[in-house]
Structures are given as C-alpha cells and as structure tokens.
C-alpha cells in the first residue's frame, strides 16, 4: 500500500494559464471534447430548471444516470466588474467558485474577448479543499499593461461538457492618446487645395485634436478626434503635425513635410556606353524629379557639321532605365547629344551637351563591271572588276571580298578570297572541272563588308577544251550570263 | 493517511474472467475519481479510463471498451476492476490511482499494483 | 489523442550529476503535466504535478519546468536512489497519455 500525508490543507495552483494576446484557440481542449471516442461524460446538466431564469453562468444539475443522486448547482463568485488603470501599471484580478468534491473532473481556463488565453505567464489557480468542497480561486496579472490589454476577461469551467462562465471583467487602460491615424506626407500642386487626416483615441475620451503648421497653430478651437484639415493651397514646402489631447495629456504626431511640385532638374552625367555606324547607346543620371514621377524623358541629337542644317532629331523615350539606343545616325559622323524629362508639371531643362561619334560604316555599294573567264593553260578563273563608288561615311576601302561557289552534279562547295584594296584583279584556281563557277565581289571596309556583287557564272570544262570568252556582270535586266564551251 | 491497497496476483486461463479490487482509506472515497492503469510487461503505463465515485459514471479509454468494467461498493470505500474473455495480451499489473484535488486530473496515490497472468 | 514523445528513452549517469529528460506534447497541454518515478516492481510515485510544483515530500533536488507543447524534469545532483523510470503525464484531455519513459541507469 502506498501512504502519505495529506495534502489538503495547502493551496494548490492549477494551469497558469494563458499569456495575455496569444489569441488562438485550441479547439482539442476539454473545453471543446466532443462526446466521441468512448469519453461518455461523467455528469450531465440541464440548461434550464423550473421556476428560475437561466442566467448563463449557472450549472444547474438534474438527477445522474448512475441513480437518484442530485449535484448542487455552480456558480462563480460575483466579483469587480469593471477596472480602469493607467498604462503600464500592473493589474491583478481573480475569479473564484467554490466546486463540492463530488464533481470530480474539472477544468479552468482564461478567456478574452472570446478567445481563450493560451500559455501560462499570467494566470495561475488555487484550491483550498476541505472534506466536502474545494474553494478554487483563478488569478490573472498583467505587469505593465497596455492598450492590447482592453478588453473583457472571464473563467470558465468545464465540468464535462458543461460550462460554467464567470461575470465578464472589463479591463480599461488608460493612456494619453494613441494615433491611430497620423498625418501623411504629400507632394501638391502650387496653390491646389489638399486634406490632412489625423485621429487619435483612448480611453479616456474624448480626444481633442489641434492641428500645427510649421510650429503655429492653425485652429484656435480644438477639433474632436478624427479631424481632417483642409488646406487651401500652399506656395512653399510646409511641415504639419497634429496634437492629440485627453484628460492624460497630448500627444504629438510625427511632423510631415508638404512639397511643392515643380519641373525637374536636368539630367546629369550623360554617358556613352557603345557606337557602331549607326547607332550610339547612351544611359543619364536623372536629376531630381521635382516631387513628382518622372513621365518620359526626350535625347535629343545635333549634327555638328559645318555643312549640315542643324536640325535637332528628337527621340523620346521612356523615363526608366535611364537608357536610350539612338538609332538611325549616319556612319562616321559627329553629334551632339543632350537629355531633357518631364512630370507631370513639365520638362526639365536639357543635359549638358556631349559629343559623340559613329563608327566607319560598310561600303552600300558593290563593286562595278565584274567580268570572269578562264585561262586553261593556267588552269585558273582571271576576275576583274572596277572600284566602288564609296561615300565618304563608308570610311576607307581596305579591300575586297571575293565568293566564288562550284557546283557540279549536286555538290556545291563556297570559297573566298580577301585581295588588298589597290586590286582590281584576281586569279584564281579552278576547282572542279566540268562545273560551273559562281562569282560575286563585296568591297570591305574598316566598317565592315559592302554588298556584293550580282553573281557572275563560267561554265569550266573537261581538260582540253579552250575559250576565252568572258562572262561579265549582266546589263539590268538580263539573266545571268553562262558561257558554256 | 490515504492509502489504496489492491488485491493480490491472479493466475487464469485465457477465456476466464478477473475482478481486482482497489481499497481506500483515509480519506473521503466519493469525493476523489478513481483511475485505471495498466503495465505489459517491460513495458509502459497505459491510461484505462477512471470511474466517478459519488455517480458511479465510468469512463474507458478506447481499447479498453466491452470486456473491461470499472463499478463501486461505496460502503467499503472500493473500486472495482474486472476483465473478462482474458487473453494472453491483458497479462500485466493493473494500478489504481486516485484523481488529485478537484479541477486537475493527475494522480497523486497509488495503490501497489495487481499481476495478472493470463496463460494456458 | 495527445501524444507524449519523451527523451531520451534511457540515459547512464554518476551520482552528483545533473540530469534532464524532457517530454513534448503534440498539442497545447497548458500546465497540465504530472512526473512519476517508477522503480522495478514498485507502484509509480509521484513527484511533479501541473508542470512544475513538487508534491510533499518530494527533495528539491527534483524540478520541474515549461508550458503549452515542451516540459522537462531536472533532477540535480543525483543520488543512488534516484534510480529508476522516470514517466510524464499529460492530463489536461481525454484520453490521458503518458510519456514512453526514460530509464535512468548507472554509469
């Protein structure tokens, strides 16, 4: 047998319950135990009795099912209702039953504002039991309350799926005013009227609000909270605030500063990041967008040419990325580039101007007059053809590229040549005999290769066969010549 | 001082029935639930269920429903346990343990345990 | 149902160590676990209930601490009777479920 001295005579605590905002609820508590899983409840009550109103935190008994036992009803202790304290302070308050032993399976919870209180910082339980009843006392503290901490608190009890629920205890704590909408800063049109909105609450109530224009009062009579200040229109930056008054004391929102919108500031830092012939990618620094977005921004491009008009190619852009491809520009030429943007109120001033340049282009012209014909005892293809006429743009002919194709019974294989740019001819070996020879002439650049030339076609015969004839760059309009031998 | 004291070791065949008895004094025996453990050999505690002693409603863990009756003799201050249809599984000591003060559910008396040994 | 994951499920250690098994609950239990010393062929004893009050007669060298889901039992400087199986309790719902137990053993 196992013995001990009883224990009855001290207090016992019980589930320090539950850490003030941890709100959610447990739904597999006892609290909530469905009459599943074999758990047949041990006592069972009826809502209502006779002759007495149901007051909501009464368990009034009916006789068990084990027999002709009657179990007294239950009911909490009536206890403050009501507690106002100051912030931070700490508060402690209880709620108390006393339960005959014959109830012999109970549980005790915090709930606030219908949550239960989960965890076990703040609340604990004692017994006082004696033979026939146990006198159980539920305290719940706070240290250093706050706002969160508002609302109504109650015990409850489970005595199987019975719930007996204490008074509420309403919790009121009270501070100097608390925002709860503040002032935002604002970018306004010159002379355009805009709103301010601030609130602030308690407890205690009322609040009273006064509105602050760079330091000064704007309303001589306080407002109550929630206030909005209409302002007429401003013609320079502005800082408002809003003080917020109770019988605590006031509070000051933050200070908000009110821009005035105006045109942006130029673009800085105009930079060039690739040129080819015809294009130059260039990126800017914005400037600063005047309190409000930038819309789209405009690059701007001169040529500086003496023999040029001076007209001014405007390309616009998107404001971001702070990017711009200029396109269309004229081979080995020089520009002058500048970056305006605008906003809603309008554009900024041009970017300092810089210079940029383009590349040397390819030549736009092919080689003229190309002739082709073989010489058998060399057994080589002679081509000929004369100078392009090259723009100056084009840069400096550097020299040629010569595409000669054979083709013989379904294969076709392509060769080239480069030739310096003093030539304006070459000689080249016969590949395949009893094939045909495809040949075109592009004119090569610093800038890159021209176009070529219109295919010129030679017939090379078997060994021992002998022509002289050329095949030459055909007249607009007639088809490729093919000398056949 | 509280005390349960259990009844001695049983030896039965598989099929037959056993009823164990969990006797408490010092104390009021209507106002404590009386809880049911049992222990396989080697092995853990394993919740039964418990018996309210002023209602006489039981309540069985599941696993431990049909063969398994907790009843009262509130005269003599006892609690009953008794298992029927035995099987070579249900070999094991069976503890009562009273129910701690109101509104908890632990255990805080033991009574010493009884072996039942179910074996052919 | 609650389950109770107690560990470690066995441990070796010297008389005057510092000794901590723990149990975890797979659901919020708030405070509702009890510590029971059980030793070969002997009924449990009890030694903490509601997570961390010592019953009478229990030595102080046995603690008991945590809420909601974690809860652990510290036994500082142990001594030659404090051999044994060590089981927690779960008992805030139905059913009521004990932790597998951790056997404290002699190094």
């Known amino acids: 047998a196992i013995t001990e001295a009883r224990e009855e005579a001290k207090p016992y605590p019980l589930f320090p319950g539950p850490l003030p905002g941890s709100l959610q609820t447990d739904h597999t508590s006892l609290l909530s135990l469905p009459h599943t899983s074999g758990y047949q409840p041990a006592l069972m009550f009826s809502p209502t009795q006779p002759g007495r109103p149901y007051t909501g935190n009464v368990a009034i008994p009916r006789v068990t099912s084990a027999g002709s036992k009657l179990l007294p009803p239950l009911a909490f202790k009536h206890t403050v209702g009501h507690i106002i304290l100051s912030e931070h302070k700490d508060v402690k308050f209880n709620c108390s039953i006393s339960v005959p032993n014959i109830y012999q399976d109970t549980t005790i919870s915090w709930w606030k504002d219908g949550k239960e209180l989960l965890g076990a910082h703040h609340a604990i339980t004692q017994f006082y039991p004696d033979d026939e009843v146990t006198a159980i006392i539920a305290s719940f503290s706070i240290t250093s309350v706050q706002r969160s901490d508002n609302g109504s608190y109650i015990c409850k009890m489970k005595i199987n799926n019975e719930e007996i629920v204490s008074d509420p205890i309403y919790i009121e704590v009270q501070g100097l005013p608390h925002f709860t909408k503040q002032p935002e800063s604002m970018n306004v049109t010159r002379n355009t009227a805009f709103n301010l909105t601030c609130q602030a609450v308690g407890p205690p109530e009322p609040v009273n609000i006064f509105w602050v224009q760079n330091s000064s009062r704007v309303n001589e009579q306080p407002e109550k909270s929630p206030s909005v200040l209409t302002v007429p229109g401003l013609t320079e930056m502005a800082v408002f605030s809003c003080e917020a008054h109770n019988d605590k004391g006031l509070t000051v929102s933050k200070g908000v500063q009110i821009n005035i919108k105006a045109i942006p500031s130029p673009p800085t830092e105009v930079s060039i990041h690739n040129s080819t012939a015809h294009s130059i990618l260039i990126s800017w620094v914005p400037g600063f967008d005047g309190y409000s977005p930038f819309r789209n921004c405009s690059v701007q491009v001169k040529e500086v040419d003496p023999l040029s008009n001076g007209s001014v190619m405007i390309f616009n852009t998107s404001a971001s990325p702070h990017m711009y491809q200029i396109k269309q520009l004229q081979a080995l030429a020089n520009y002058s580039i500048g970056v305006s943007c605008m906003n809603e109120i309008g554009w900024s001033a041009v970017s300092p101007w810089i210079l940029a340049s383009t590349t040397e282009g390819a030549p736009s012209v092919a080689p003229l007059n190309v002739t082709v014909f073989l010489n058998e005892s060399r057994d080589n293809v002679d081509i000929r053809w004369m100078k392009p006429l090259t723009k100056r743009q084009a840069g400096e002919l550097v020299g040629y590229r010569i595409s000669h194709v054979w083709q013989s019974a379904g294969i076709s294989k392509e060769l080239l040549e480069e030739v310096g740019q003093n030539n304006s001819r070459a000689q080249i070996s016969v590949q395949v005999h009893n094939a045909t020879c495809t040949v075109r002439i592009a004119a090569v650049t610093k800038g890159g290769v021209g176009p070529f030339s219109d295919p010129v076609k030679i017939f090379i015969p078997a060994h021992g066969w002998v022509d002289h004839a050329p095949s030459s760059t055909p007249a607009p309009g007639n088809a490729d010549p093919v000398l056949i031998i | 001082q509280v005390q349960l004291v259990q009844s001695g070791s049983e030896l039965k065949k598989p099929g037959a029935s056993v009823k164990v008895s969990c006797k408490a004094s010092?104390?009021?025996?209507?106002?404590?639930?009386m809880n049911w453990v049992r222990q396989a050999p080697g092995q853990g505690l394993e919740w039964m269920g418990w018996?309210?002693?002023?209602?006489?409603?039981?309540t069985y863990a599941q696993g431990f429903t049909g063969r398994f009756v907790f009843s009262l003799d509130t005269s003599v201050s006892t609690a009953y346990l008794q298992i029927s249809s035995l099987k070579a599984e249900d070999t094991a000591v069976y503890y009562c343990?009273?129910?701690?003060?109101?509104?908890?559910?632990?255990?805080?008396?033991w009574g010493q345990g009884t072996l039942v040994t179910v074996s052919s | 149902d609650i389950q109770m994951t107690q560990s470690p499920s066995s441990l070796s250690a010297s008389v005057g160590d510092r000794v901590t098994i723990t149990c975890k609950a797979s659901?919020?239990?708030?405070?509702?676990v009890a510590w029971y010393q059980q030793k070969p062929g002997k009924a449990p004893k009890r030694l903490i209930y509601?997570?961390?009050n010592r019953h009478t007669g229990v030595p102080s060298r046995f603690s008991g601490s945590g809420s909601g889901t974690e809860f652990t039992l510290t036994i500082s400087n142990l001594q030659p009777e404090d051999f044994a199986t060590y089981y927690c309790?779960?008992?805030?719902?139905?059913?009521?479920?004990f932790g597998g137990g951790t056997k404290v053993e002699i190094k």
């Open positions: 343990a009273r129910k701690g003060v109101t509104a908890a559910r632990y255990f805080d008396y």
């Open positions: 010092g104390y009021t025996f209507t106002n404590h639930g």
């Open positions: 018996i309210n002693t002023y209602t006489g409603e039981p």
């Open positions: 659901q919020n239990v708030r405070t509702a």
């Open positions: 509601l997570a961390s």
């Open positions: 309790l779960q008992h805030w719902n139905y059913p009521l479920t």
